[in-house]
């Protein structure tokens, strides 16, 4: 089978601090040494890029300094964390994996993780 399969959880609930974590696992049809992982957000059939990182197999994922994503990798598994989420960011987050090097190139796209974000209630003022 030449197509690459990507698995990710169907649903994740963000923490009260607006942090959501999920695992993105891919079945590699080739022996890639350089992999690119992209998180996409799909809302109303529009797809936008949330963050992306390219890493060497065996090394850590490095997102840009200003990225809202962090992650670690272990074999064909990537642990992704998205920070700074608010209720309006609730949506479908798709894990896209590309085996970049050596050729041939392979693309794998997960079915998406529905991330639910609930803004915390503001603390009531205390009267003493």
């Amino acid at each position: 089978c030449k197509a690459m399969h990507v698995a990710q959880p169907a649903v994740v609930l963000a923490s009260s601090r607006g942090i959501a974590s999920f695992v993105c696992e891919y079945a590699s049809p080739g022996k890639a040494t350089e992999v690119r992982v992209t998180v996409l957000r799909q809302a109303d059939s529009q797809v936008t890029e949330v963050c992306a990182a390219t890493y060497m197999m065996g090394n850590e994922l490095t997102f840009l300094d200003d990225s809202i994503c962090t992650g670690t990798s272990s074999g064909n598994q990537v642990n992704l964390t998205i920070q700074g989420l608010r209720a309006m960011d609730t949506g479908l987050y798709i894990c896209k994996v590309e085996l970049m090097y050596p050729p041939p190139y392979y693309l794998g796209i997960g079915n998406g993780t529905q991330i639910y974000v609930i803004d915390p209630e503001p603390c009531p003022d205390s009267d003493f």
Partner: antibody, heavy 118, light 107 residues
Framework: EVQLVESGGGLVKPGGSLRLSCAAS????????MNWVRQAPGKGLEWVSS????????YYADSVKGRFTISRDNAKNSLYLQMNSLRAEDTAVYYC???????????WGQGTMVTVSS | EIVLTQSPATLSFSPGERATLSCRAS??????LAWYQQKPGQAPRLLIY???SRATGIPDRFSGSGSGTDFTFTISRLEPEDFAVYYC?????????FGPGTKVDIK
């Protein structure tokens, strides 16, 4: 408006060279992988080459490997195809195409015709 | 290299009819399959990606289905502007390959 405009096509003798350009506008060019696809007269579509957003990764069809070189200049929002050792079978309309976030080729230029003949 | 087969090469319909085109891959491409429309003298236009998702601005009379090796593209009710050549393409691995195309012409 999202747009790709190719240029540089023309008539060239077998063994000759040509450089195609593709000018992008209306989107953040540096964020997208790009492709060249060709179509011989009366025939179907054939993928030629692909280049990643930062030029780090490049792929070629076997039919052009060693003869064609893809490149890009993100500062100029431009994609290029340097074609050397041209053959009659390279005669085609050459299209540049953007790779969409989900993988397919979502935006295409109008094409530029390359004719290789003596 | 993954080979895509489209059959037949030409299909003839009258406006208003339903058109169903097929594309078969030599090995599994999962759902990494797109459909393009091309009219004479024009560039291809993306219609369907991911086997069944419509591209932005594409009318809902166009639809796609299938996964693995067998795919179907359907135009529910042919409009005069739909008579063109339709190509399938796999984009899951390089080299990215296209089918030979199916021409939909007027009966």
């Amino acid at each position: 408006e999202v747009q790709l405009v190719e240029s540089g096509g023309g008539l060239v003798k077998p063994g000759g060279s040509l450089r195609l350009s593709c000018a992008a506008s209306g989107f953040t060019f540096s964020s997208y992988s790009m492709n060249w696809v060709r179509q011989a007269p009366g025939k179907g579509l054939e993928w030629v080459s692909s280049i990643s957003s930062s030029s780090s990764y490049i792929y070629y069809a076997d039919s052009v490997k060693g003869r064609f070189t893809i490149s890009r200049d993100n500062a100029k929002n431009s994609l290029y195809l340097q074609m050397n050792s041209l053959r009659a079978e390279d005669t085609a309309v050459y299209y540049c195409a953007r790779v969409g976030l989900m993988g397919p080729f979502d935006i295409w230029g109008q094409g530029t015709m390359v004719t290789v003949s003596s | 290299e993954i080979v895509l087969t489209q059959s037949p090469a030409t299909l003839s319909f009258s406006p208003g009819e339903r058109a169903t085109l097929s594309c078969r891959a030599s090995q599994s491409v999962s759902s990494y399959l797109a459909w393009y429309q091309q009219k004479p003298g024009q560039a291809p236009r993306l219609l369907i990606y991911g086997a069944s998702s419509r591209a932005t601005g594409i009318p809902d009379r166009f639809s796609g289905s299938g996964s693995g090796t067998d795919f179907t593209f359907t135009i529910s009710r042919l409009e005069p502007e739909d008579f063109a050549v339709y190509y399938c393409q796999q984009y899951g691995s390089s080299p990215f390959t296209f089918g030979p195309g199916t021409k939909v012409d007027i009966k």
